[in-house]
Interface confidence: medium
């Protein structure tokens, strides 16, 4: 009989229902925007905006200051008052649409849905380790803002993304706003613009550069700006928009828009379609050849990557990569694949593709029929012609006009579909040691911290825990403050350590000590924790072996039993080879001699399941008593493994020594040709791992084995004679004298 240890699912080594409590702040309303500030004199702050209010928090998430930002027209509105005596526009609530830091001053800039989307500048005043906001400045000059030309109208009620860039001594605001016909008619915010903040903080300089969805497309062509960021020489916006101006507006895709961060102009505005797919390793029949498209970007973040992921992406460590969470459609509803997928786009490669797209448009040879694109922003044209023109004039350059790169940038899900039903709603990526970690918020209010690695068929979790009991979705924007990330869910802001909230979700010592170094996990007797949680017994260097099961559960008092032990932390080496004298097994008082591992039986174990097996030969001592006893495994002097060494003892109850008794054998005669079905009756006949019925020294082939009965077929006899019949269990003879008579056939 070839008994094998049952597999333990990998998930059994962790418990994601463990409750973690992280610092939080109740904002008193749905959090609309959040940004953090870290000064160079150890002062820091968290700014949290809700409808009609802006909170200033200290690094401990305690409230430092609160400012009324609305309703517009209300005498209590502190920001409105900065614009002088009103009225300044229709009354109404202020929903914060933009909350950004201007690093040059430094100052906080907030822009709301009221008062034509104007902004307010709040100088930062450090007070110890906390920060206060100075009285707000109204970034709006009534005399040079008109409904059809309004440099100070920044925020759109439909959503606006802003990235602030310092160029020389000036601050440039790169602004992208969602528009529709109604919004465009009211103080004309632009789709994409670059606005310079005036030195006297009275607003933005007039004559700014901008692109806007053409009036004829405003009703049907809506662009959602999902994320913006600045890295290297460029500012990037990420959009979700209809794939075509002319086709079905509900057929969406994702684009990256690139603007120069060194020249405040839009001639080199470029767009590129980002294509993220789920391509399962084994493709289902009927599944699309290139993988299932996930065209809609939900959240994004760019970050430098650690060594391992860099190698997998064929880029250098520390290179900036854009990570995006994509879904199949606006509702993110379930398809045949996972709900969310994560794709990685190296920035350097995005830039290369854009630059070469420009060459394709502007350099010889001319590619016939190649469109400049962006027909929602500009008149249609073919490369290399400028928008709306049939040919280049001598003083124009093909390169100095916006362009949609003709090829898309395609990537596949880093997680290979393993996010499954999880709907990711927030993303922030960090590099810890040489590991790249995705910190993700979910639709049901959980935080998943997972290593970004593409070569595995399971997720490597730092943590997976619930932020609170509300189960509300985690919001899109995440901020970092020191070694913590700030996530918003409902009306709460939560402070989550980048290294994870703790180690208690790791249930076994082995899993605990295999956790990433940055988590600071150690074993405290019977639980995994950080050093501060368990003074005294905390250690990171060894784990005891862990017995979970053994087979068989009984063995003969006389004779040997081949015992198989199951569990973990027996070897630490996949080969299962153990140095001499390191493993001691005792059953009761009796030693069990370790057996060399049968290499023919070694089989690869997928990391999703794990179990270790250890075999030994049990020969009871003469002093061993009948009855129940313990199995004990002690491991000492083992060389250390990659993460820890095995050292200690594990004891499991439930083994019994028994004495087999043979009571009756029938029939006692049969033909010389053999084949007689013998029935042996007794007690404890099935104990141990081996038994044999011998007729005149030849084995009688066993047909059935049970505790009280053995059935076997007699071998042929040499002559007609009475011959001895005996039963051996574990190689030792069961007491009793029996004979079998061979007769003529």
């Amino acid at each position: 009989e070839d008994w094998q240890c049952p597999r333990t699912p990998y998930a059994a080594s962790r418990d994601f229902d463990v409750k973690y409590v992280v610092p939080s702040f109740s904002a008193g309303g749905l959090v609309q925007a959040m940004v953090t500030y870290e000064g160079d004199r150890n002062e820091s702050a968290v700014f949290v905006a809700i409808r009609n209010r802006l909170h200033v928090l200290g690094p401990d998430l305690k409230s430092v200051q609160s400012l009324a930002t609305g309703p517009a027209g209300d005498p209590g509105c502190q920001t409105c008052a900065a614009c002088g005596p009103g009225p300044h526009g229709p009354p109404g609530d202020t929903d914060t649409k933009v909350l950004v830091l201007d690093p040059a001053l430094p100052a906080l800039v907030s822009c709301g849905s009221s008062l034509q989307g104007r902004c307010f500048l709040h100088d930062l005043e450090p007070q110890g380790t906390a920060v206060h906001l100075a009285a707000p400045a109204c970034l709006f000059s009534a005399h040079h803002n008109r409904p059809d030309d309004c440099p100070d109208c920044v925020a759109s009620p439909l959503g606006t993304r802003v990235t602030v860039v310092e160029q020389g001594q000036a601050s440039y605001f790169y602004v992208a706003s969602s528009l529709d016909a109604a919004v465009a008619a009211s103080f004309s915010p632009r789709s994409v613009s670059i606005r310079r903040l005036k030195a006297d903080a009275s607003g933005f300089a007039p004559g700014f550069v901008a692109l806007s969805v053409l009036p004829k497309h405003l009703v049907s062509y809506s662009i959602e700006y999902v994320h913006s960021f600045h890295t290297g020489a460029f500012v990037y916006f990420l959009t979700v928009q209809p794939a075509s101006v002319t086709d079905d507006p509900s057929a969406l895709h994702t684009r990256l828009a690139r603007l120069s961060a060194t020249e405040p102009e839009l001639g080199d505005y470029r767009e590129l379609v980002l294509d993220c797919r789920f391509a399962p390793k084994r493709r289902r029949r009927g599944a699309p050849e290139g993988g299932q498209p996930y065209p809609v970007l939900r959240v994004a973040h760019s970050a430098p990557v650690g060594a391992q992921l860099a190698t997998e992406l064929s880029i250098a460590e520390g290179q900036e990569v854009l990570f995006g969470v994509f879904v199949t459609g606006k509702d993110g509803g379930p398809g045949v694949g996972p709900n969310s997928v994560v794709c990685a786009f190296p920035i350097d490669l995005l830039d290369t593709l854009i630059d070469e797209g420009v060459e394709r448009c502007c350099e010889s040879p001319v590619h016939p029929g190649l469109r400049r694109g962006l027909d929602f922003f500009q008149s249609p044209s073919f490369c290399p012609n400028p928008p709306g023109l049939e040919a280049l004039s001598p003083n124009t350059s093909c390169r100095h006009f916006p362009l949609l790169v003709s090829s898309s940038f395609s990537r596949v899900d880093l997680f290979n579909g393993l996010l499954g039903p999880v709907q990711v709603t927030a993303l922030y990526v960090t590099r810890l040691d040489n590991v790249t970690v995705a910190h993700m918020g979910t639709m049901d209010g959980r935080i998943l911290q997972v290593e970004l690695v593409r070569s595995l068929n399971y997720l490597l979790y730092v943590s997976n825990f619930s932020l609170g009991d509300s189960g509300q979705p985690v919001q899109r924007d995440v901020s970092r403050l020191g070694d913590h990330l700030l996530f918003a869910s409902g009306d709460q802001v939560f402070q989550v350590p980048i290294q994870g909230p703790g180690c208690r979700h790791f249930l076994t010592c082995g899993r605990c000590l295999r956790a990433w170094h940055f988590m600071g996990c150690g074993w405290c007797g019977n639980m995994c924790g950080q050093q501060k949680e368990c003074p005294g017994s905390w250690q990171q260097d060894h784990c005891p072996p862990k017995l979970t099961e053994f087979h068989p559960h009984s063995g003969p008092l006389r004779g040997s039993t081949r015992l198989t032990l199951c569990g973990s932390n027996f070897y630490l080496h996949p080969s299962g080879l153990v140095p001499e004298g390191t493993h001691q097994v005792t059953v009761g008082q009796s030693p069990c001699r370790p057996l060399p591992k049968d290499s023919s039986k070694l089989r690869p174990v997928p990391r999703k399941d794990f179990v270790e097996e250890f075999e030994c030969e049990l020969e009871p001592l003469g002093t061993q008593a009948v009855g129940p006893t313990n199995v004990s495994l002690t491991v000492t002097n083992m060389p250390p493994g990659k993460h820890f060494r095995v050292d200690g003892t594990s004891v499991l109850r439930g083994f019994s020594f028994m004495e087999p008794v043979l009571i009756a054998v029938q029939p006692l005669f049969g033909p010389r040709a053999g084949g007689t079905c013998l029935t042996l009756e007794g007690q404890s006949l099935s104990v141990g791992t081996s038994r044999a019925v011998l007729v005149n020294g030849t084995e009688c082939l066993l047909a059935r084995v049970s505790e009280g009965q053995l059935l076997c077929a007699t071998p042929p006899g040499a002559t007609v004679a009475s011959v001895p019949l005996s039963l051996q269990v574990g190689g030792a003879q069961v007491p009793g004298s029996w004979t079998f008579q061979y007769r003529e056939d």
Epitope: G232, E312, L313, S314, I315, A316, Q319, E320, A344, P346, I347, D348, L349, D351, T352, L353, D355, E356, G357, V358, E359, R360, S407, S410, R411, V412, R454
Partner: antibody, heavy 118, light 115 residues
Amino acid sequence: EVKLVESGGGLVKPGASLKLSCAASGFIFSSYGMSWVRQTSDKRLEWVASISSGGGTTYYLDTVKGRFTISRENAKDTLYLQMSGLKSEDTALYYCTRGQWLLKFAYWGQGTLVTVSA
Amino acid sequence: QLVLTQSSSASFSLGASAKLTCTLSSQHTTYTIEWYQQLPLKPPKYVMELKKDGSHSTGVGIPDRFSGSSSGADRYLTISNIQPEDEAIYICGVGETIEDQFVYVFGGGTKVTVL
């Protein structure tokens, strides 16, 4: 006019190292992916390595991975191929090429000969 | 595995129309390829990019008599009114990105002789 000029080839013994250079002119070097392609004595072409415009992304032929390193210095309009652990099968004429999104080699240099022989 | 197959040589009479074939491996029949020309003692020269639907764009300085077409796994380079200066080796090439790893392969080349 696009011009690519390779240098640095020569005769070396197996196991030795060599660094090839490619001086580029006539185009905005920092906007293009660049590649090295080699041609063996039987006239077969073999792509060796590619690098993105900014230099952050590199790709290699499996047989040279770990031995060859492609790099670029955009400030000097120069592409490099550092070759170590050279083998006799690396003997070839090495061309520097300008790639159009890595996948096509629109312009080629004249090549530099690398001979690996005991 | 991505493979391109070409016949090793072909001869054509002066002024004739020459059609060269490059065949993609069976699982890559939709791929766009490139054609290159290598004149004796010269580096290769980019001739054209050729898509699965037969559409193509030629490189700088390539005469109009060079055209491309496609059928299934086959990609054709046609030289109409072939001239002595067209005597060269014609090589096809193709690139692909698999799971962020890039490879580019060339065919063995077809040596064209003008009689």
